[in-house]
């Protein structure tokens, strides 16, 4: 359940998350499976360990195996698993198979390619993007934060799309390519100002104090695929994560097309052991897209 | 309401097997870590086995090799497997609530079922 | 493993007077995230032991507040401001850093 492929190309950096998350203060060790030895964590090392991080600076064919990595959580250690695979470059173009990250798909509304794991590295932009291993050029193409978008896309815009980047590590710099195919789809997609399904406005919600409640935030964008379009929850006008309340979390917006290809998007807040003062809370569930801004607000009462 | 109901207990000869379950509701069941902790005749609080939300299991000494935890989460449903049962197992066996082992969150053993009697005689 | 030792054994008590529960394990129960994972629960005669306290100081759900856990590392204590009749039973320490062990109970009876 908690193991993870990874993979990379020798001589550039790679950097692998352990797949049994924890919180950020929890300790983290990691070990090569087959031998039982610990990784160190002092920089000066080729590969070593850093919290949750595994890191191949830069990495050679021979690190390819199974990493452990043992989270120190409370009351358990748990496990993960990370099976790494180093390949050689590549003397061609072809980029085969087993390097290629998920396939995603654009519209000529929405032609975002995000580059793959970027998030592990400390780059620092713009990132250089290929396709096909030639590189992008004219004004159609914006390299923008960690992604490529592209105006007008058009079906012969498909292919595989390669991103590149510089990891800095204590002042040395490592390459990085990530590469992951684009298809176009043909469809007559439209974006509005978002419409909220759930909850409904001042709605208010009966809660037992001390047991469990989710609560949804659920809205609508437009038809097809969308640039933006993002649900969250506040609390009191605060976004959740400045909210430092550990039962209070809310989980990824899970994105939703109907029958009718409608584009929404669910937000899930979960409060646990529900108390009193959660009671005071004012629960905003926020929709936004390049239209705009729409709010519902929700109250939880005690149930009677 | 959140709630834990054990059932499987009985009289057992030394050497028997037993198989005990424990039920939940009111809850997201396959997010927390869940236990079972036993009460001999007179006696204290003593943990038995846990599970946590991958599955990975967890025993101390006096148990491994003949205790089995085991977790059913579309049924909502903890185990224990015992075989091997000797004596100093007679207990009433709790099934409890641990951690929410997906947010890392711990409030405590939060829930205890009302336990079962398990009990190894000849 | 560690291991829990409470005191004392047995409290015999006045309602509406103040008790003391002591409870000391064998190694710190403070984790890296910064909280003692140190709870605290009642077993009343003849039923499930129920949480009072966790992570050393947090009142349970419910719990009233006459409950009151403090102590860090090693040392912890259960405060109950004014004893009630309802508060008889057996309280247990327990720790939660690595797996669970429980103290060997302490009883609170009615003098």
């Known amino acids: 359940k908690f193991s993870k492929q990874s993979w990379g190309l020798e001589n550039e950096a790679l950097i692998v998350r352990c797949p049994r998350q924890g919180k950020s203060s929890y300790i983290v060790d990691w070990y090569y499976s087959q031998t039982n030895k610990s990784i160190p964590t002092q920089e000066r090392n080729r590969v070593f360990a850093s919290g949750q991080l595994l890191k191949f600076l830069p990495a050679e064919v021979a690190d390819s195996g199974i990493y452990t990595c043992i989270v120190r959580s409370p009351t358990f250690n748990r496990t993960g698993y990370a099976n790494v695979t180093i390949y050689k470059k590549q003397p061609d173009c072809n980029v085969p198979d087993y390097l290629m990250y998920s396939t995603v798909s654009g519209s000529e509304k929405n032609s975002k390619i995000y580059c793959p794991t970027i998030d592990l590295y400390n780059w620092t932009a713009p990132l250089e993007w290929f396709k096909n291993c030639q590189a992008l050029q004219g004004s159609r193409y914006k390299a923008h934060k960690s992604f490529l978008v592209i105006d007008n896309v058009m079906t012969d815009d498909a292919g595989d799309y390669t991103c590149k980047f510089i990891h800095n590590e204590n002042g040395a710099n490592y390459s990085v390519t990530a590469t992951r195919s684009f298809t176009v789809k043909d469809e007559q997609g439209f974006s509005r100002f978002p419409v909220i399904r759930a909850p409904a406005h001042n709605e208010t919600k009966e809660v037992e104090i001390g047991e469990n409640t989710n609560l949804t935030c659920s809205a609508c964008f437009g038809k097809g695929a969308q640039f933006l379009a993002t649900v969250q929850w506040q609390l009191n006008g605060n976004k959740i994560t400045d909210f430092s309340e550990p039962r209070i979390q809310q989980e990824e917006g899970q994105n939703q097309s109907f029958s009718n290809g409608l584009a929404c998007v669910n937000t899930v807040l979960r409060i646990a052991d529900v108390k009193e003062e959660d009671l005071l809370l004012r629960y905003d569930c926020l929709a936004l897209n390049l239209h705009g801004l729409r709010r519902h607000t929700i109250r939880l009462s005690r149930k009677n | 309401e959140v709630q834990l109901v054990e059932s499987g207990g009985g009289l057992v000869q030394p050497g028997g097997s037993l198989r005990l379950s424990c039920a939940a509701s009111?809850?997201?069941?396959?997010?927390?870590?869940m236990h079972w902790i036993r009460q001999a005749p007179g006696k204290n609080l003593e943990w038995v086995s846990a599970?946590?939300?991958?599955?990975?299991?967890y025993y101390p000494g006096s148990v491994k090799g003949r205790f089995t935890i085991s977790r059913e989460d579309a049924k909502n449903s903890l185990y224990l497997q015992m075989n091997s049962l000797r004596a100093g197992d007679t207990a009433v066996y709790y099934c409890?609530?641990?951690?929410?082992?997906?947010?890392?969150?711990?409030?405590?053993?939060?829930?205890w079922g009302q336990g079962t009697t398990v009990t190894v005689s000849s | 493993d560690i291991v829990m030792t409470q005191s004392p054994l047995s409290l015999p008590v006045t309602p509406g007077e103040p008790a003391s529960i002591s409870c000391r394990s064998s190694?710190?129960?403070?984790?890296?995230?910064?909280?003692?994972?140190l709870d605290w629960y009642l077993q009343k005669p003849g039923q499930s032991p129920q949480l009072l306290i966790y992570?050393?100081?947090n009142r349970a759900s419910g719990v009233p507040d006459r409950f009151t856990g403090s102590g860090s590392g090693t040392d912890f204590t259960l405060k109950i401001s004014r004893v009630e009749a309802e508060d008889v039973g057996v309280y247990y320490c327990?720790?939660?850093?690595?797996?669970?062990?429980f103290g060997g109970g302490t009883k609170v009876e009615i003098k």
């Open positions: 599970i946590d939300l991958a599955g990975d299991t």
């Open positions: 992570l050393g100081s």
């Open positions: 009111g809850f997201t069941f396959s997010t927390y870590d």
């Open positions: 190694q710190s129960l403070l984790h890296s995230d910064g909280y003692h994972y």
């Open positions: 327990m720790q939660a850093l690595q797996i669970l062990t």
């Open positions: 409890a609530r641990g951690g929410d082992g997906y947010n890392y969150d711990y409030y405590g053993i939060d829930v």
